[in-house]
């Protein structure tokens, strides 16, 4: 018996359904085909569970998160062993193994590895303003989604007709923030946080209104 | 070095449709504000498009709205000119241009070498 | 025709000066930044002014920029025969949200 390579990993975003692949040979018929395929969450790498079992001619359900959701691809038996996932899950995330026995064939590789990631487009980002807006102050633009994976980028623009941040301005794009130094009316508009990563893309808008100083009455 | 290369130009029959792309490298592409730029034989210098930082905003000239649409890819560092409906008048060498991050107003201080599109039957 | 009217020619000996106009209009120049580009022959343009005023690093004092109300002017004194060229201006309208080159003048120097 001899499971086939599996591709190494497979991609997919949250809610959408995934197929995890399984193929064998054997010499053998497929009277006492024997598959379980079970999963070492990502997020709980010591507990492995079991996502669901073919035995003795009939289907068992694994772990209850997965009740409803999962079956196999093809009508069993088969030397096509692939599954499904419906409706994936961040806690989905993790490396799945099939398990396969048909005997009286032994020997050879029985296991096939393959790795899930669940993908999560980044959540609507939230803007703030750090520092004073008083004319010649520095201000720092905030931006963070709480949800994404893989972790989203973040890119600042100034919604003027140049496109383009102040030349006082510096960002980082890994943590979401723009410094603006020295700030004046020129300063002054409306900023964008464009939020992405390989699977999506979510916006938030700042308004930023320079404070140009009072002038003081005298006596 | 710092430089953008454009490619994608050729002869395309009215009609048609052309991908130009122009590639980056040397500065930081995904924190630069790109344009194309094209210059019709013995004319002038006509503004085509622009994208933000980040492609999610974009300008274009009237005579192109609607027919062209600038895209980037900043993994690739790479900006792009998805040009369709192409009219004889289309018919320029088309550049690829940097806007400066030392400037407030719109300054294209980096330009490609330029990728010509013939438009004729 | 461009929304930015440039002279179409302009021309003077070696040495001297020579100013180049860009007449726009209060959505454009008149509260806009103006940027200033030469292109020689066969080649593609290059950043002479950026800013009204600014010359980034590389360009010679020889040029300058101003602007006043509507209109913005390139001047370029010492007149040098490799200044035989192009010469275009460039600002944004804050309605169309379009970048708008001038119509571009030939300088030669004679």
């Known amino acids: 018996l001899e499971v086939s390579e599996s591709p190494g990993s497979i991609q997919v975003a949250r809610g959408q359904p995934a197929v995890l692949p399984c193929t064998f040979t054997t010499s053998a018929a497929l009277i006492n085909l024997n598959v379980i395929w079970m999963v070492t969450p990502l997020s709980n790498a010591n507990q492995p569970e079991q996502v669901i079992l073919y035995q003795g001619g009939q289907m068992f359900d694994g772990a209850p998160r997965f009740h409803g959701r999962v079956g196999f691809t093809g009508t069993m038996p088969a030397t096509n062993v692939s599954i499904f996932i419906n409706n994936t899950q961040l806690s989905d995330t993790g490396t799945y193994q099939c398990l396969v026995n048909n005997l009286p064939d032994i020997g050879g590789r029985n296991i096939g590895v393959t790795g899930l990631t669940v993908l999560v487009p980044p959540s609507a980002p939230h803007c703030q303003i750090q520092g004073s807006q008083d004319i010649g102050s520095d201000v720092i633009l905030l931006c963070s989604s709480e949800e994404g994976i893989p972790r989203p980028t973040y890119l600042w623009e100034k919604l003027d007709n140049t496109l383009k941040l102040p030349p006082t301005a510096t960002q980082d794009q890994v943590q979401g923030t723009v410094t603006i130094r020295n700030i004046s009316a020129l300063s002054s508009g409306l900023y964008q946080c464009v939020a992405s990563n390989a699977i999506g893309t979510s916006t938030c808008l700042l308004d930023l209104q320079v404070i140009s100083p009072q002038p003081r009455n005298i006596g | 070095e710092v430089q953008l290369l454009e490619s994608g130009g050729g002869l395309v029959q009215p009609g048609g449709s052309l991908r130009l792309s122009c590639a980056a490298s040397g500065f930081t592409f995904s924190q630069t504000a790109m344009s194309w730029v094209r210059q019709a034989p013995g004319k002038g210098l006509e503004w085509v498009s622009a994208a933000s930082y980040s492609g999610y905003s974009t300008y274009y000239a009237d005579s192109v709205k609607g027919r062209f649409t600038i895209s980037r890819d900043n993994s690739k560092n790479t900006l792009y000119l998805q040009m369709n409906s192409l009219r004889a008048e289309d018919t320029a060498v088309y550049y690829c241009?940097?806007?400066?991050?030392?400037?407030?107003?719109?300054?294209?201080?980096?330009w490609g070498q330029g990728t010509m599109v013939t438009v004729s039957s | 025709a461009s929304v930015l009217t440039q002279p179409p020619s302009v021309s003077a000996a070696p040495g001297q000066k020579v100013t180049i106009s860009c007449s726009g209009s209060s959505s454009n120049i008149g509260n806009n930044y103006v940027s200033w580009y030469q292109q020689l022959p066969g080649t593609a343009p290059k950043l002479l002014i950026y800013?009204?005023?600014k010359r980034p690093s590389g360009i010679p004092d020889r040029f300058s920029g101003s602007k006043s109300g509507t209109s913005a002017t390139l001047g370029i004194t010492g007149l040098q025969a490799e200044d035989e060229a192009d010469y275009y201006c460039l600002t944004w309208t804050g309605a169309g949200r379009i970048f708008v080159f001038g119509g571009g003048t030939k300088l030669t120097v004679l």
């Open positions: 800013d009204n005023n």
């Open positions: 241009a940097r806007d400066s991050r030392d400037a407030y107003g719109v300054a294209f201080d980096l």
